[in-house]
Structure formats: C-alpha cells, structure tokens
Amino acid sequence: KSEMPQPVSIQDINHRVWVLQDQILIAVPRKDRVSPVTISLISCRHVETLEKDRGNPIYLGLNGLNLCLMCAKAGDQPTLQLKEKDIMDLYNQPEPVKSFLFYHSQSGRNSTFESVAFPGWFIAVSSEGGCPLILTQELGKANTTDFGLTMLF
C-alpha cells in the first residue's frame, strides 16, 4: 500500500478540469489561463474493513492546500464539501473516516468516485460548464460521473 499521496490531474470526458474558486471546486473547460488543481489521492490503509468489489477506497485532497473532499448531509441530501484537513491525518486514523472516503472504480480509462458514507452517490459535474462538483445518484443523465485520471510526477 502506498504511504504517500499520489498527485493526479483529473478531467471529465468533456475535457473540463477541476478549479478551486472561493473554496468550491468547479469544472471548467481547459484553457490557457485556467490553473487546474492537482488532486492528492491515497488509498485507505484499512481496506480490509471496507466493502470489497466496489472499488479502491481512497481519500481525495487538494495538493498542498490542506483541503480534502468529504460528503455530509445537508437536510436529506448528501452534499460534496471541501474541509480543511491533512490527507495524511485521515490516512493514519485508526478507522476509515468514511465521510472523506470514496470508492475509486476504473473501467478502461474512466474513473468513478462513489461516496463510502453514502453508497450510490457519486462525484459528478453538470453537463453544463462552470458548475460546482456535486454528488449525484443519477448516473449518465444530466451529470457526468466519469473522469480521467493522469498520474503526475
């Protein structure tokens, strides 16, 4: 198991990249002046205590920014949030911190990220550009849940 976060670049199938704007992650078309965030990804060290065959449980952070992606309920609905958190602190915890964990599933070049805390809810971006990342249960409809990962360094 890796003990160092892996920096990756993420874009969706429409070649939109993730950008941080006012502490919110949004997906925008890749252009010259756009600076996409680098995502840090690390596998949960307690993989044997999580569901098998759902994907690799990972924590997702923003490289160098001490911010991690997490899922929390707002009313009845799970929402995607950024929380100030050191990804290695999550990694080292004695139990999986499920609100910050995602099952990373790969099919060919496409990756999906399913919330561990809210099974059936996936990281998604609206089919329109310039929208915040969200969680959705609606696969392949108005939202894109398939992403491409490029390992950096």
């Epitope: 205590t49 999580l50 915890q93």
Partner: antibody, heavy 121, light 109 residues
Amino acid sequence: QVQLVQSGAEVKKPGASVKVSCKASGFNIKDTYIHWVRQAPGQGLEWIGRIDPAIGTTRYDPKFQGRATITTDTSTSTVYLEFSSLRSEDTAVYYCARLHYFGNNFFFDYWGQGTLVTVSS
Amino acid sequence: QAVVTQEPSLTVSPGGTVTLTCRSSSGAVTTSNYANWVQQKPGQAFAGLIGGTNDRAPGVPARFSGSLLGGKAALTISGAQPEDEADYFCALWFSNHWVFGGGTKLTVL
C-alpha cells in the same frame, strides 16, 4: 440523546455461550463503529473487538478471535456480542461503546451501562 | 501484545492539578497510538474525555487536557473539582487493535 442500552445480567455454565445485546438510539449506528470491552472483577478494561454496522465488517483482539462474534441488526439499531466456550475467567462486565469521529479524531464517547456475565458451575 | 500501564491510584486536592499517565510496554507512546481517555464516575456509565492524544470530546470541560509526556500519554486535570473523583482509563491503538490500561482511581480530597 445518544444512548446505548444493554441486555440484562446472565449466568452461564462453563463451556456454554452467551449473547449480549446493545441497542443504540439518538444516532444512526451506520455512522459509527461499535466496540465491545470487558472488565473482570478488580481488573482493568479489555478490548474485545468492533463492528462497522454499515457494512458488517469486524475486527477482534487476537486473544478473542474465534470465541467472540460481533454482529449487527441495523433494522433495530442493535449490536450483539456472542461469546462461546465460556470459562470462569470470562466472568466480567461486558460493555458496548461507540467510537465516533468528531472534528479531527475518534472518541470512545458513549458507553452502555454494562452487562454482568457470570460463568459458574 | 503490548501491556498498557496506569497509576493504580492518585489523590489531588480540590483546585489542584494532577497528571495521570499511560505507559506502553512496547516503547514510547506517540501520536500514532491515538490515545483515548475515558472516565467512569461511581454508579455512572463511562464517558469519553480525550481522543487522538489531545482532542477534547464535545462538552468536556477545558480543565481536562491530553498530551504526550516523557514517552507516555498523559491526562492533566487543572483545577480539580470534587466531581472529578472517578476511575480513568486510557486506550492506545496498535495497528489493528486497541489496548486499554488498568485504570487510575482518582480521589479528590
């Protein structure tokens, strides 16, 4: 309010099994981990194991692996500890405890009232 | 398997400061042991005080603080109150299991 309510005292003969229950209220057990700990008369606490009620996966102290079985029924928010091949030295108060992530860390924050299991011939 | 040792008993005067410690037979206690401290008052259920070495549980008074002290986990009560008379137990994490200590009986006298 958060509560863990355990089943009543049990008296068992050596070699028998016992099943203790822990009913949770005031929170969703799927959002936490439930642990079992015991305290023999005049002794400290001894960790037995834990369950992730959302998934059903368990962890046990190697000392109790094979004799302790932790299960859950999420429909009733109840966690069970079954202890087999009982010996007199298993006489203890058995506690369930919630291990909950809050802020930056996990806490053994809420505990059941304890269940006395007496093993005697 | 590691053995976790605590002072069997300690006494503190009301308003005084006392430090309870938690030693591991397997070497120095570190932040990777995620020390937890729980309290049991006479006739009451256990209640969590400290997690992750030095984080106070919600609602725990500020007079309770956790730290590492000379290779041991420590719980300090500053300005002890009569209601702090209780049994205190530490728990340490070792890779895939927890080990609890034998407990400290604290008397406020």
